[in-house]
Interface confidence: low
C-alpha cells in the first residue's frame, strides 16, 4: 500500500513571493509523483516545479495558484493510486490603481453643491483600510463637509462646493503592505463669485508716437472688478491718469489703449481682477518701445578666387529682434546658388573675380532699418610691369632698384638684401609702387637684392645684383690741422681708395717743394727732427686714371709741449682757514690752466668771494669749510695738447689747545697757516 | 535678501551740494521704481519723487522739483538723488524706498553748517 | 494734493490693550492707502498695504479696514515692542503723501 508521511497542508502565502507544499510518500514498489491542481494536472514552469515530491513556488501568483491543490502518488507496475488532502494557499496582496469618479457619471456634470463621489481602486486581501489625500492632505472623517468611510474606498463629498477643488488622492494597507493610487483625480469646482481669466494681456512692442493696447476682461458673478496699474504701482483710470500716462484710456471692456507712446510708458502693465470672493487674479503684459541700433561697422573682405568665404551680419540690437538680408547691386540674395544668404551669413561658394564688389547686409524692424556695407575684393597673383635690373651703383650717390607689379588687391612689396630683409631706416626706402631706395650708397651695399611681390591670392619674386662703383676718397680723411713736437720725429698719413688704387703725394700749399729732412713715402709725410719752419699748410693729392684727383689741406703746427713747473701738492687745512694750491704750467702756445674741484670745473666767473684763481694759476680758497674737502686738479691745456695734474685737500677742526701745550706747539700733521 | 543700502552721513555747507547714493541687492533692480522721501528730526515723513530706473522717468513732489535730481545706474543698481542749493532746512535724514514702500533703505543724515 | 489726517497725534494704552489709530484722506482714494511703523531711532517699516493687505512677517494682531476716504489701522493686544510712531500714506495720486503720524506710547 501507498502511505503518505507528509502530506500538503493550507497555509497563508505572500503574492510574490516563496512557498513550499511537502508531499513524501512510502510504497513498496516504484512510485511516481505529480500534482493537481483543481483536478488539472499542474506543469512544472521556471515559476511553480516540482522538487523530489514537495511541489516548490519561486513566487505566488494569485491568479495562477488560487485553487486546489493535490499530491498523487501512483504505482505504475500495480496501476494502485493514492491522493493526499487538498491543500490551498490563503494569499494576502495589495494593488495600486487609479482615484475615479464614481458620481455623477462625467466631469462636466460636476457642478457647485452638488454630491460628488470618489472611487478608490486599490485592491487587495485582505481588504484594505483606505486612506484619503486632498493636495497630499490626510482628510479625516467629517472633515470639511464631506463624509468618509476608511474602511470603504469610497469618499463622498456633499455638498461639493469650490472649497474641495484639489488634487484627490488615495492610499490603502493591508496584511501584505501598502499602496497608493496609481493615477490622481483633478477635482475643480468653479465659484462664480471668483475672477476667472477670460483674456489675457499679451507682451507688445510698439514704435515710438504709435498706440499700443491691451485687452484684458474677467468674468465672476457678481461681475469682477478690474484695475490697471502701471510698473509696479501706479493705477490708470480715466478719472485718475498718472502724468506720464496721461494719454492712456481704460474702456469698459477692460481694454487699456495708450496713444503716442513715449520710452516712459514702457514697461510692465498690470491688469488686477477681483471677484466678490477669491484671490485677486494678477496679469502682467510688458510694452516694449520698438529699437534698433546701429550695426558694427564690417572691415573690408579679400578673398582668393576659388574659394568659398563667409561673411556674418551681426544684427543690431533690436526690439522686436530685426529681421537681416543680404543685397548686391540692390538686388536681394537668393538661399541658394553660388553666391547666396544662409541665415545671417553672406556665402560666396567658389569665388570668381566678378564677385568682387559692394555687398550689403540689412536689418529692419518697427522701429527702423539699418544697413552697413562690406567691400569685397577678390585677391589676384601679381604680374611684372618692371623686374629688377642687375645694377651698378656710386658710391655715395643715392641708387634705385625697380620692383613694379600690379593685382587686386594692390601688392604688398618687400626687399632682401642677402637674405636679410630690408627694414626701412635712415639709408632705405621702399616707396608705394614697390621701387627700393638706397641713400648714400656704400661699398658694402654691391650684393644681391631680391623683392617680394604679393596679394592673398600668391606671390612673384626676383632678384638683382648691385656692383657699387667706388668713389676716390681718403681713407680715413687726414685731420684738418695737426700738432708736431717742436725737436721731435713727426709722420702725417694719408691714404685714399678708388675704383683703381691711386697714387698719393705731398706738397706744401704753396707750391714750394719739401725740405730735404721732410721725406714723402708712400702718402706718409715723415718729419725727421722738427723745425719751427716746419709749421704751414701742406696738401694730400690722391688720383688715378678713370676718377681724376682729389685734395686734403692740413695746417700743421710746431708746438713745445706742456710740462709742469709746479703742481699742487696734498694739502691739510683747519676749518675757517685759506687753503693754497699752487699750479703752474709751461709750453707753446702758452697754456692756459683750468681747475677742477669736486668733480666740476670751476668757472672763474662763477667762483664767488671765496674763491680766487691767480694769474700764475694757482687757486686760492677762503674760509675753508669741511665741504671744500676733496680732489683738486690743475688742468694745463694749449691748442696742441692738455695735461692734468691732481691733488687732495683736507679741511680739519682746529684742536682745542691741552694744558702742557703752550701756545707754539706745531700740529701734529704738515699745515698751511695763515 | 532684498536690501538697500545708502551712503554715509553728509556735513555740507549753505549753498553746495550733495549725492546720496542707495545701492539695491537681492532684487532684479530694473523691476522696481526707487522713492526718496526726507524726515526732518522728530517729524513726519515727506515724498520727494520716484525713478523708474528700467526707463530712467521721474516723477517729483512740486515742493521738491528745484531741490532733488533723481538719476540711477543700472549696472551698478544704484539709485542717486543730488541736493543742490543747500540750506538749513535740508537738514534730515533722507531714505530711499523700493515700490510699495516695502522695503527702506539704512536713511544718510545730511547736515547743513556754516 | 491729497491731505492725509490722522488721529490721535498720540496714544497711551495698556499692554493686552486693543487700539485704534484713524487716517482720513481729504479726496477718495479707493484702496490705496498703507500703515507704517517707526520705532525710535529706526527706518520706517510697513505693515500694511491696500488698505488690509497684512505685509509679510507682520504679526497678525495688526489688521487695516476702510476704503474711499476713511481708513483704520487696529493693534489687538498691545505687546512692548509695539512702541512706535505709526504713519499712514496714500497712493492713490502723486505727489504721494503722509499722515503726520501717531505716537503710541505704554501705560
Known amino acids: 500500500a501507498i502511505v503518505f508521511i507528509k502530506q500538503p497542508s493550507s497555509q497563508d502565502a505572500l503574492q510574490g513571493r516563496r512557498a513550499l507544499l511537502r508531499c513524501e510518500v512510502e510504497a513498496p514498489g516504484l512510485v511516481h509523483v505529480y500534482w493537481l491542481l483543481d483536478g488539472a494536472p499542474v506543469q512544472d514552469t521556471e515559476r511553480r516545479f516540482t522538487q523530489g515530491s514537495s511541489l516548490s513556488f519561486a513566487a505566488v501568483d494569485r491568479l495562477q495558484d488560487s485553487g486546489t491543490f493535490q499530491c498523487v502518488a501512483r504505482d505504475d507496475v500495480t496501476g494502485e493510486e493514492a491522493r493526499s488532502a487538498n491543500a490551498s494557499f490563503n494569499i494576502k496582496w495589495i494593488e495600486a490603481g487609479p482615484v475615479v469618479l464614481k458620481h455623477p457619471a462625467s466631469e462636466a456634470e460636476i457642478q457647485p453643491q452638488t454630491q460628488v463621489t470618489l472611487r478608490c481602486h486599490i485592491d487587495g486581501h485582505p481588504r484594505p483600510t483606505y486612506q484619503w489625500f486632498r493636495d497630499g492632505t490626510p482628510l479625516s472623517d467629517g472633515q470639511s463637509n464631506n463624509t468618509v468611510s476608511s474602511k470603504e474606498r469610497n469618499l463622498t463629498l456633499r455638498p461639493a462646493g469650490p472649497e474641495h477643488s484639489g488634487l484627490y488622492s488615495c492610499c490603502a494597507h493591508n496584511a501584505f503592505g501598502q499602496a497608493c493610487s496609481s493615477q490622481n483625480f483633478t477635482l475643480s469646482i468653479a465659484d462664480e463669485s471668483f475672477a476667472r481669466v477670460v483674456l489675457a494681456p499679451q507682451d507688445v512692442i510698439v514704435a515710438r508716437n504709435e498706440e499700443a493696447m491691451f485687452h484684458c476682461q474677467f468674468s465672476a458673478q457678481p461681475p469682477p472688478n478690474l484695475q490697471w496699474l502701471f510698473e509696479d504701482e501706479t493705477p490708470i483710470t480715466n478719472r485718475s491718469r498718472p502724468p506720464h500716462l496721461r494719454r492712456a484710456t481704460v474702456f469698459a471692456n477692460g481694454s487699456l489703449l495708450l496713444t503716442q507712446v513715449r520710452p516712459r510708458n514702457a514697461g510692465v502693465y498690470r491688469c488686477i481682477g477681483q471677484g466678490q470672493r477669491g484671490p485677486p487674479v494678477i496679469l502682467e503684459a510688458t510694452l516694449h518701445l520698438a529699437e534698433i541700433e546701429d550695426m558694427p561697422l564690417f572691415e573690408p573682405r579679400v578673398f582668393t578666387a576659388g574659394s568659398e568665404e563667409r561673411v556674418t551680419c551681426l544684427p543690431p540690437k533690436g526690439l522686436p529682434e530685426p529681421s537681416v538680408w543680404w543685397e548686391h547691386a540692390g538686388v536681394r540674395l537668393p538661399t541658394h546658388g553660388r553666391v547666396y544668404q544662409k541665415g545671417h551669413e553672406l556665402v560666396l561658394a567658389s569665388i570668381a573675380e566678378s564677385d568682387a564688389g559692394v555687398y550689403t547686409c540689412h536689418a529692419a524692424n518697427l522701429a527702423g532699418q539699418r544697413r552697413q556695407d562690406v567691400n569685397i575684393t577678390v585677391a589676384t597673383v601679381p604680374t611684372w610691369l618692371k623686374k629688377p635690373q642687375d645694377s651698378q651703383l656710386e658710391e655715395g650717390k643715392p641708387g634705385y632698384l625697380h620692383c613694379l607689379t600690379q593685382a587686386t588687391p594692390k601688392p604688398t612689396v618687400v626687399w632682401y638684401r642677402n637674405q636679410m630683409l630690408i627694414s626701412e631706416d635712415s639709408r632705405f626706402e621702399v616707396f608705394k609702387n614697390g621701387t627700393l631706395r638706397i641713400n648714400n650708397v656704400e661699398v658694402y651695399d654691391g650684393t644681391w637684392y631680391r623683392c617680394v611681390s604679393s596679394t592673398p591670392a600668391g606671390s612673384i619674386e626676383a632678384q638683382a645684383r648691385v656692383q657699387v662703383l667706388e668713389k676716390l676718397k681718403f681713407t680715413p680723411p687726414p685731420q684738418p690741422q695737426q700738432c708736431m713736437e717742436f725737436d721731435k720725429e713727426a709722420t702725417v698719413p694719408c691714404s685714399a681708395t678708388g675704383r683703381e688704387k691711386p697714387t698719393i703725394k705731398w706738397e706744401r700749399a704753396d707750391g714750394s717743394s719739401l725740405p730735404e729732412w721732410v721725406t714723402d713715402n708712400a702718402g706718409t709725410l715723415h718729419f725727421a727732427r722738427v723745425t719751427r719752419d716746419d709749421a704751414g699748410n701742406y696738401t694730400c693729392i690722391a688720383s688715378n686714371g678713370p676718377q681724376g684727383q682729389i685734395r686734403a689741406h692740413v695746417q700743421l703746427t710746431v708746438a713745445v709741449f706742456i710740462t709742469f713747473k709746479v703742481e699742487p701738492e696734498r694739502t691739510t687745512v683747519y676749518q675757517g682757514h685759506t687753503a693754497l694750491l699752487q699750479c703752474e704750467a709751461q709750453g707753446d702756445p702758452k697754456p692756459l690752466i683750468q681747475w677742477k674741484g669736486k668733480d666740476r670745473i670751476l668757472d672763474p666767473t662763477k667762483l664767488g668771494p671765496r674763491m680766487h684763481i691767480f694769474q700764475n694759476g694757482s687757486l686760492v680758497i677762503h674760509d675753508v669749510a669741511p665741504e671744500d674737502s676733496g680732489r683738486y686738479t690743475c688742468i694745463a691745456g694749449n691748442s696742441c695738447n692738455i695735461k692734468h695734474t691732481e691733488a687732495p685737500l683736507y679741511v680739519v677742526d682746529k684742536p682745542v689747545p691741552e694744558e702742557s701745550e703752550g701756545p707754539g706747539s706745531p700740529p701734529p700733521y704738515k699745515m698751511i697757516q695763515t | 535678501q532684498v536690501q538697500l543700502q545708502q551712503s554715509g552721513a553728509e556735513l555740507a555747507k549753505p549753498g553746495a551740494s550733495v549725492r546720496l547714493s542707495c545701492k539695491a541687492s537681492?532684487?532684479?533692480?530694473?523691476?522696481?521704481?526707487m522713492h526718496w522721501l526726507k524726515q526732518r528730526p522728530g517729524q513726519g515723513l515727506e515724498w520727494i519723487g520716484y525713478?523708474?530706473?528700467?526707463?530712467?522717468?521721474?516723477e517729483y513732489n512740486q515742493n521738491f522739483k528745484d531741490k532733488a535730481t533723481l538719476t540711477a545706474d543700472k549696472s551698478s543698481s544704484t539709485a542717486y538723488m543730488q541736493l543742490s542749493s543747500l540750506t538749513y532746512e535740508d537738514s534730515a535724514v533722507y531714505y530711499c524706498?523700493?515700490?510699495?514702500?516695502?522695503?527702506w533703505g539704512t536713511g544718510t543724515t545730511v547736515t547743513v553748517s556754516s | 494734493d491729497i491731505v492725509m489726517t490722522q488721529s490721535p497725534s498720540s496714544l497711551s494704552a495698556s499692554l493686552g490693550d486693543t487700539i485704534t489709530i484713524t487716517c482720513h484722506a481729504s479726496?477718495?482714494?479707493?484702496?490705496?492707502l498703507s500703515w507704517y511703523q517707526q520705532k525710535p531711532g529706526n527706518i520706517p517699516k510697513l505693515l500694511i498695504s491696500?488698505?488690509?493687505n497684512l505685509h509679510t512677517g507682520v504679526p497678525s494682531r495688526f489688521s487695516g479696514s476702510g476704503s474711499g476716504s476713511g481708513f483704520t489701522l487696529t493693534i489687538s493686544s498691545l505687546q512692548p515692542e509695539d512702541i512706535a510712531t505709526y504713519y499712514c500714506?496714500?497712493?492713490?495720486?502723486?505727489?504721494?503723501?503722509f499722515g503726520s503720524g501717531t505716537k503710541l506710547e505704554i501705560k
Open positions: 524706498a523700493r515700490s510699495y514702500f516695502d522695503v
Open positions: 537681492g532684487y532684479t533692480f530694473t523691476r522696481y521704481w
Open positions: 525713478i523708474n530706473p528700467s526707463s530712467g522717468y521721474t
Open positions: 479726496q477718495n482714494i479707493n484702496l490705496w
Open positions: 491696500k488698505a488690509s
Open positions: 500714506q496714500q497712493g492713490q495720486s502723486y505727489p504721494f503723501t
